[in-house]
């Protein structure tokens, strides 16, 4: 009787334990499958594309972006797949030859046709944003600016893409979209903290980077200042991105891009020239170039220096002296007048600089050419290198950089000097804060610049609120997979023990 009772108990217990083990294994397997499948949904990858044309003052560039459709609102999923530089000058130079605009855009638009799958053409948006070169043309004549844009629109409408229009963006937009671009690419809008960083400039904190953009006709500075209140509402922007509020300062200095700054400097210096020879410290010794006075006064940027000269042309003769060039450049910045607590120059409000800055576009191109983009190069070293570079004879420079177009090559001394002057005297960076400037060309394969931010905004890909994230973070996913795998392993071991050594397992159960 006792034996029967004992065997019944054993049978009951073993059945229950087997049932529990079986149930646990099934749960673990289901959990593993569920977690695995939820996390790694085998959806057909639906890729979307977007095209933005940056119609700058000196040239036009076409950028193609792609992103997975399912992750449209995620941060950091859009990346650049192609950049095509249009051959020729900026669109504002086509005012006398608008009939050539169609041909001008052909190569890059055809390249876009090749890169983007044909099935996607009709749903790929195309945006063209024109910047300071066209702002200057519009300042001279709205009719001429309209005419250029009309022809551009007609040309772009002939392609199979979803053309969304061509417009002149404001300086504020240019600054803001550049700021959005670099912070998006640096992962600053992501609310998840990372255990490791794959972005070279990325600090683990979520503090945004400031943006320093230099073009041919304008320059922009945009950052989140420490003090939330602003003395100048014109320079204040409010964003809500991914559930967080940002109070941003931005200003665009029209005519202070590197090319227009050079025209300004020449117009200023020729005023005091005794004859038609301009000895210029911003060009290498031995460099010579003839400039038409009519070209000098063509731009509104030189209007304040305009005067009747006793000659139609003058010759620039380089003398290659960094210090004198620096002094000449400083005269472009009026720092004598400031109606605010602090100004950049020309009476424009500038709050105290805060945090790290990404300096891109021509800031990067020029400093990269001069080999001065390294984080380790101090401001003093940069100045030293510039002194050395500017004093090199023109013939020597031409030999050393035989592959570089002379027009560009001749201007690196001025451009480098101008960048230093703008950053130090214009924006008030110091030798100490210089290390907070990071000269950036690309971030994870995407060019730093306003175009990505512009497209993200126009395609509504930056939500105001933090979107519902993927079902699990990577760490939670790994943890759950390990946990359920362990459960399965333990269940398997216990099962083996039960069936191989049952007496050992039951011996104390009476």
């Amino acid at each position: 009787m006792e034996d029967t009772k004992e065997s019944n108990v054993k049978t009951f217990c073993s059945k229950n334990i087997l049932a529990i083990l079986g149930f646990s294994s099934i749960i673990a397997v289901i959990a593993l499958l569920a977690v695995g499948l939820t996390q790694n949904k085998a959806l057909p990858e639906n890729i979307k594309y977007g095209i933005v044309l940056d119609a700058g003052s000196s040239h036009t560039s076409l950028y193609i972006y792609k992103w997975p459709a399912e992750k449209e609102n995620d941060t950091g999923v859009v990346h650049q797949v192609e950049e095509c530089r249009v051959k020729g000058p900026g669109i504002s130079k086509y005012v006398q030859k608008v009939n050539e605009i169609g041909i001008y855009l052909t190569d890059c638009m055809e390249r876009a046709r090749e890169v983007i799958p044909r099935s996607q053409h009709q749903e790929t948006p195309v945006y063209l944003g024109a910047t300071a070169g066209m702002r200057l043309l519009r300042m001279e004549s709205e009719e001429l600016a309209d005419r250029v844009l009309d022809v551009v629109e007609r040309s772009l409408s002939n392609y199979p893409f979803d053309f969304q229009g061509a417009r002149i963006i404001t300086g504020q937009e240019e600054g803001a979209y550049g700021w959005i671009t670099i912070n998006y690419l640096l992962g600053k809008f992501s609310q998840k903290t990372r255990w490791f960083s794959i972005v070279p400039y990325e600090t683990n904190n979520q503090e945004t980077f400031g943006a320093l953009d230099l073009g041919g006709a304008s320059t922009q500075i945009t950052f989140v200042p420490q003090n939330q209140t602003t003395e100048s509402p014109d320079n204040a922007l409010q964003f809500r991105l991914y559930g967080k509020d940002y109070n941003v300062y931005t200003h665009s200095f029209l005519c202070y891009g590197k090319d227009q700054a050079l025209w300004q400097k020449l117009a200023k210096d020729i005023q005091v020239a005794s004859n038609e020879i301009l000895r210029d410290p911003c060009f290498h010794p031995g460099y010579k170039k003839v400039v038409n006075v009519s070209d000098l006064y063509k731009t509104p940027c030189t209007k304040r220096f305009e005067m009747t000269l006793p000659f139609q042309q003058f010759e620039i003769q380089g003398i290659g002296n960094y210090q004198q060039c620096h002094q000449s450049v400083l005269e472009l910045f009026n720092t004598s007048y400031c109606p605010y607590s602090q100004c950049a120059f020309n009476g424009i409000f500038l709050p105290p600089l805060q945090g790290d800055f990404g300096a891109f576009s021509a800031f990067y191109f020029v400093m990269n050419f001069l080999n001065l983009t390294s984080e380790k190069v101090s401001q003093e070293k940069v100045t030293e290198m510039m002194k050395k570079f500017c004093s090199q004879p023109w013939e020597e420079i031409k030999t050393s950089y035989a592959g570089v177009k002379e027009k560009y090559l001749s201007e690196y001394c001025f451009s480098g000097t101008y960048i230093l002057s703008l950053l130090l005297q214009g924006y008030h960076f110091t030798a100490d804060s210089w290390e907070h400037i990071h000269f950036i060309g690309k971030i994870q394969g995407s060019d730093a610049g306003w175009t990505l931010g512009y497209m993200l905004n126009l395609t509504n890909m930056i939500p105001a609120e933090q979107p519902l994230s993927t079902p699990l973070s990577h760490s939670t996913y790994v943890f759950l997979m390990v946990l359920f795998s362990l459960v399965l392993v333990i269940v398997a071991i216990i099962g083996l023990l039960i069936f191989h050594k049952p007496s050992y397992f039951w011996k104390d159960m009476v």
Epitope: Q96, V98, K303
Partner: antibody, heavy 116, light 111 residues
């Protein structure tokens, strides 16, 4: 929306100077030139000159060269037109107008009366 | 200076009828394929209002009954069907070169 608001009417004696202001809003002040145009009673519109607010450079009609001065205060988004050595024939409504070559936006006008 | 000559000096048109104003420039006001010719409407006590720019483009908010044509030196403003609110003085202007000049004006009234 773009708005240009001018200062009030002025009465001046011959030989004196007058300074009319034009406060702009609704756009980036330094992105467009500011022109000044006047209209004497029953007369055609007459262009005085313009300023590039970006840098303060200005251009005038030969008729007003040396007598008219146009200035700006970019921090206040305001343009000013000063006319000196006033004579009775300067009695007119003075307008500011925004534009490069297209005067799409005008101030409401400021009546300047020159009378002894 | 480019002289702008408007004709007629005044014009009386019945409501719903067509009104045509001409403007002749002393030299071509075309440049880079654009006519730097503008038409403005001015009512008593008000600043001028831009009607037509670039000779033939309508200003924003301008009724379709206003149209402009011409190039070079000869230009026309047409009001296809005159309305009571169109009673005003109309001016042409060139901005091809400094000094920018205006026509003498055409007074439009209802017959």
């Amino acid at each position: 929306q773009v708005q240009l608001v001018q200062s009030g009417a002025e009465v001046k004696k011959p030989g004196a100077s007058v300074k009319v202001s034009c406060k702009a809003s609704g756009y980036t002040f330094t992105d467009y030139n500011m022109h000044w145009v006047r209209q004497a009673p029953g007369q055609r519109l007459e262009w005085i000159g313009y300023i590039v607010p970006l840098n303060g450079g200005s251009t005038f009609s030969q008729k007003f060269q040396g007598r008219a001065t146009i200035t700006v205060d970019t921090s206040a988004s305001t343009a000013y037109m000063e006319l000196s050595s006033l004579r009775s024939e300067d009695t007119a409504v003075y307008y500011c107008a925004r534009g490069g070559t297209r005067f799409a936006y005008w101030g409401q006008g400021t009546l300047v009366t020159v009378s002894s | 200076d480019i002289v702008m000559t408007q004709s007629p000096d005044s014009l009386a048109v019945s409501l719903g009828e067509r009104a045509t104003i001409n403007c002749r420039a002393s030299e071509s006001v075309d440049n880079f394929g654009v006519s730097f010719m503008y038409w403005y409407q001015q009512k008593p006590g008000q600043p001028p209002k831009l009607l037509i720019y670039g000779a033939s483009n309508q200003g924003s908010g301008v009724p379709d009954r206003f149209s402009g044509s011409g190039s070079g030196t000869d230009f026309t403003l047409t009001i296809s069907s005159l309305q009571a609110e169109d009673v005003a003085v109309y001016y042409c202007q060139q901005t091809k070169e400094v000094p920018y000049t205006f026509g003498g004006g055409t007074k439009v009234e209802i017959k």
